[in-house]
């Protein structure tokens, strides 16, 4: 029987009964948070052979081995993983061995076995026979191997029953427990599985089989399972499902879901039956089971039950991630926050249509509304009292609405209202009237000319750059000296610059009123000599990198018709010079004949310009005389070079550390102090452990029901 979609057994060990008839778990298996030590010996699930996703064990008291629970678990497919892992055994206080003696294949993903204080028989398992790559395995913080004394079957009687393999240069017996060897197939089978009697299975079998060379006798399938047969691909008119079996259209149409998107059922796309169309595709009609590519970003309609969605934090904005059409009203009230502009853009940047009104009030953290970078239509189907569909009130730092040169926004119905936005120039509001088609709708009091822009330099003069000079990591720029009507009103200049691979940046990108700014800022004092043009040397730049630069004059509040006069430049794009590239990466050389070497490498990580050619140099080396000192035809006494591995077993250092100089015959040495790289690696390791533990806790702890 197929069970699924994922089984979560927690708190009560008797829930294990749910596994009674399962042969395949289509999904994951969690066994976790069983704090009372129980006797698991009466629980045995010999039918279970395959888990299609992952197996997670966490804090199950009293469980000493998995071998009795799952004696025939053969394959964990890892179709979906738990933080890159297909097998996670974490904080299992009483587990003494894994014992999954029939586990032959973990198709995808790595293993993480961590913080299991009593767990042994880890060094006796050759994971390379089960996984394709063992480099991502994480086996840390378990019982130290020296305290385990792991013995494979028959070793004590000097009649070893298990086969040997080499791990980390150690050739040793491989077993799961004191009485269970790790199964290995004859080398004649190659990558194929084998029966208990070491006969090779059919190539489409995975893990094991009950009869040789028979695609109907597989315990699990390498590719797909259909009508009792293992097949390399799903037959016509059938579709891949959950990465392991083939189903027909009728089956796919009749899958019921408890996910919010279920109203339209599963879809068939690219030969697969799946819950929703993949990224970049949309259903071909509301009741269709097929997907077509989206034109531009895929539409996603989001609706607010209470009609008005209040955005007062990043968390509330998060709910709108991916939404392109918002059915309802948006009330934006962002008083504070960290890196708020880019966070809001991340979560609200795809919204194209708001069906109701948009109200922005008391949002002192906002400098611009450019985070709504795709908003093109406000329908105004619902309006605020007074027939307003765009309402902007008391935003102390709002300076820009949108970049109107690159923005089309239509307000279909309703008026606009602006008041108490001291840094928002009225000219910016008038420009919005023109672009949105609301000109003439507003009455006189709707756009207050006295309290909008009262603290902004709205009548801006343009500063012109006069010269630019570049080197590989510096830019020197100068600009015309700005001369306001009263020279004393000019205090200084501020130069803003940042990397800009494309010529599409605006002044307000990534900027908010709480200190976050994607621009680097440098203050430039006025030159004492009135005839000298102001300028700056920007240094510490990257070679062959395009930068955007603009300059603003910092002026006193010089009122002219109730408004401050200021000056700023256009944005200038300028590229630093090329430089020497960093070294080519991953250089490998191999000989394919007696007179040829093949050398391969990867491009440098920092090309610092356009790479046009590589220079390869080589020289002849003298032959190592060491190779001639032994007759390699004799079997005995082949010299073994022993290299110091530079590690020290901390647990063994019990006496006071010696302080003599290393080398010679002076005895034990001190551990060398850790290099910066080692310290950094340790720090990253600790950080990685924390990240995983947080992920684990966040994934599995759920609030109790009300």
């Amino acid at each position: 029987e197929i069970c699924g979609p994922g089984i979560d057994i927690r708190n009560d060990y008797q829930q294990l009964k749910r596994l009674e008839n399962c042969t395949v778990i289509e999904g994951y298996l969690h066994i976790l948070l069983i704090s009372k030590a129980e006797d698991y010996r009466s629980y045995r699930f010999p039918k279970l052979t395959v888990i299609t996703e992952y197996l997670l064990l966490f804090r199950v008291a009293g469980l000493e081995s998995l071998g009795d629970l799952f004696p025939n678990l053969t394959v964990i497919r890892g179709w979906k993983l738990f933080y890159n892992y297909a097998l996670v055994i974490f904080e299992m206080t009483n587990l003494k061995d894994i014992g999954l003696y029939n586990l032959r294949n973990i198709t995808r993903g790595a293993i993480r076995i961590e913080k299991n204080a009593d767990l042994c028989y880890l060094s006796t398992v050759d994971w390379s026979l089960i996984l394709d790559a063992v480099s991502n395995n994480y086996i840390v913080g378990n019982k130290p191997p020296k305290e385990c004394g792991d013995l494979c079957p028959g070793t004590m009687e000097e009649k070893p029953m298990c086969e040997k393999t080499t791990i980390n240069n150690e050739y040793n017996y491989r077993c799961w427990t004191t009485n269970r060897c790790q199964k290995m197939c004859p080398s004649t089978c190659g990558k194929r599985a084998c029966t208990e009697n070491n006969e090779c299975c059919h190539p489409e079998c995975l893990g094991s089989c009950s009869a040789p060379d028979n695609d109907t006798a597989c315990v699990a399938c390498r590719h797909y399972y259909y009508a009792g047969v293992c097949v390399p691909a799903c037959p016509p008119n059938t579709y891949r499902f959950e990465g392991w079996r083939c189903v027909d259209r009728d089956f796919c149409a009749n899958i019921l879901s408890a996910e919010s998107s279920d109203s339209e059922g599963f879809v068939i796309h690219d030969g697969e039956c799946m819950q929703e169309c993949p990224s970049g595709f949309i259903r071909n009609g509301s009741q269709s089971m097929y997907c077509i590519p989206c034109e531009g970003p895929c539409p996603k309609v989001c609706e607010e039950e209470k009609k008005t969605k209040t955005i007062d934090s990043v968390t509330s904005a998060q709910m709108l991630q991916g939404c392109t059409i918002f059915k309802g009203n948006l009330l934006i009230n962002i008083r504070r926050g960290n890196n708020i502009a880019s966070e809001l853009e991340n979560f609200m940047g795809l919204i194209e249509v708001v069906t109701g009104y948009v109200k922005i009030r008391h949002s002192h953290a906002l400098v611009s509304l450019s985070f709504l970078k795709n908003l093109r239509l406000i329908l105004g189907e619902e309006q605020l009292e007074g027939n307003y569909s765009f309402y902007v009130l008391d935003n102390q730092n709002l300076q820009q609405l949108w970049d109107w040169d690159h923005r089309n926004l239509t307000i279909k119905a309703g008026k606009m209202y602006f008041a108490f936005n001291p840094k928002l120039c009225v000219s910016e509001i008038y420009r919005m009237e023109e672009v949105t088609g609301t000109k003439g709708r507003q009455s006189k009091g709707d756009i207050n000319t006295r309290n909008n822009g009262e603290r902004a330099s709205c009548e801006s003069d343009v500063l012109h750059f006069t010269s630019t000079t570049t080197s590989k990591n510096r830019i020197i720029i100068t600009w015309h000296r700005y001369r306001p009507p009263d020279y004393r009103d000019l205090i200084s200049f501020t130069v803003y610059y940042k990397e800009a691979p494309f010529k599409n940046v605006t002044e307000y990108d990534g900027q908010d009123a709480c200190g976050s700014n994607s621009w680097n800022m440098v203050d430039v004092d006025l030159p004492p000599n009135k005839d000298v043009e102001p300028g700056i040397l920007l240094h510490g730049l990257k070679p062959w990198t395009q930068y955007a630069v603009y300059v603003k004059a910092v002026t006193l509040t010089m009122v002219e018709n109730d408004h401050i006069r200021g000056a700023k430049s256009e944005i200038l794009y300028i590229r630093t010079n090329a430089s020497v590239p960093s070294i080519p990466l991953d250089v490998l050389s191999a000989s394919n004949s007696s007179s040829q070497l093949i050398v391969k490498w990867n491009p440098p990580s920092l090309p610092n310009g356009n790479l046009s050619y590589y220079i390869v140099r080589w020289q002849r080396q003298p032959q190592d005389g060491y190779l001639y000192r032994h007759n390699y035809c004799s079997k005995d006494k082949i010299p073994i070079r022993k290299y110091a591995d530079g590690t020290i077993d901390i647990e063994e250092v019990t006496e006071n550390p010696k302080t003599e100089v290393c080398g010679g015959e002076k005895g034990p040495c001190c551990a060398c102090p850790k290099t910066e790289a080692e310290k950094q690696a340790e720090k990253e390791e600790a950080e990685y452990r924390k990240v995983f533990e947080n992920f684990l806790h966040n994934s599995i702890f759920v609030p109790r029901p009300e």
């Epitope: 029987e1 197929i2 069970c3 699924g4 979609p5 994922g6 089984i7 979560d8 749910r18 008839n21 399962c22 289509e26 009728d250 089956f251 009749n254 899958i255 019921l256 879901s257 408890a258 996910e259 919010s260 279920d262 109203s263 059922g265 819950q275 029901p705």
Partner: nanobody, 123 residues
Framework: EVQLVESGGGLVQPGGSLRLSCAAS????????MSWFRQAPGKEREFVSA????????RYADSVKGRFTISRDNSKNTLYLQMNSLRAEDTAVYYC????????????????WGQGTLVTVSS
């Protein structure tokens, strides 16, 4: 853990109607696909009907199509089965079952089960 309690069973004449209810407690009701199964004396347990988490999609066994209607009220945490035009072969113990996230057509191993309610169709 989810607790399911069925009610509404009883004796009814052929051609008559009955409405079964299943009250759920313990977890967010809408996050489960809900089903009705039945087991007649001396027979295997068989699938009757299932409904998606939102209630927007249903599935029925061929033997009950057009006669039975499954529905749910997520605000009341309750599943219903309206049974019309009842026949003698509908006599069975009816079980309510819940499965998290989704249910494929071949799924019989639901995560949670009720104790069952007996429906007898006889003249």
């Amino acid at each position: 853990e989810v607790q399911l309690v069925e009610s509404g069973g009883g004796l009814v004449q052929p051609g008559g109607s009955l409405r079964l209810s299943c009250a759920a407690s313990g977890r967010t009701f809408s996050s489960f696909v809900m089903s009705w199964f039945r087991q007649a004396p001396g027979k295997e347990r068989e699938f009757v009907s299932a409904i998606s988490g939102s209630g927007s999609r249903q599935r029925y066994a061929d033997s009950v199509k057009g006669r039975f209607t499954i529905s749910r009220d997520n605000s009341k945490n309750t599943l219903y089965l309206q049974m019309n035009s009842l026949r003698a072969e509908d006599t069975a113990v009816y079980y309510c079952a819940a499965n998290p996230r989704r249910a494929t057509p071949d799924l019989s191993q639901y995560a949670y089960w009720g104790q069952g309610t007996l429906v007898t169709v006889s003249s």
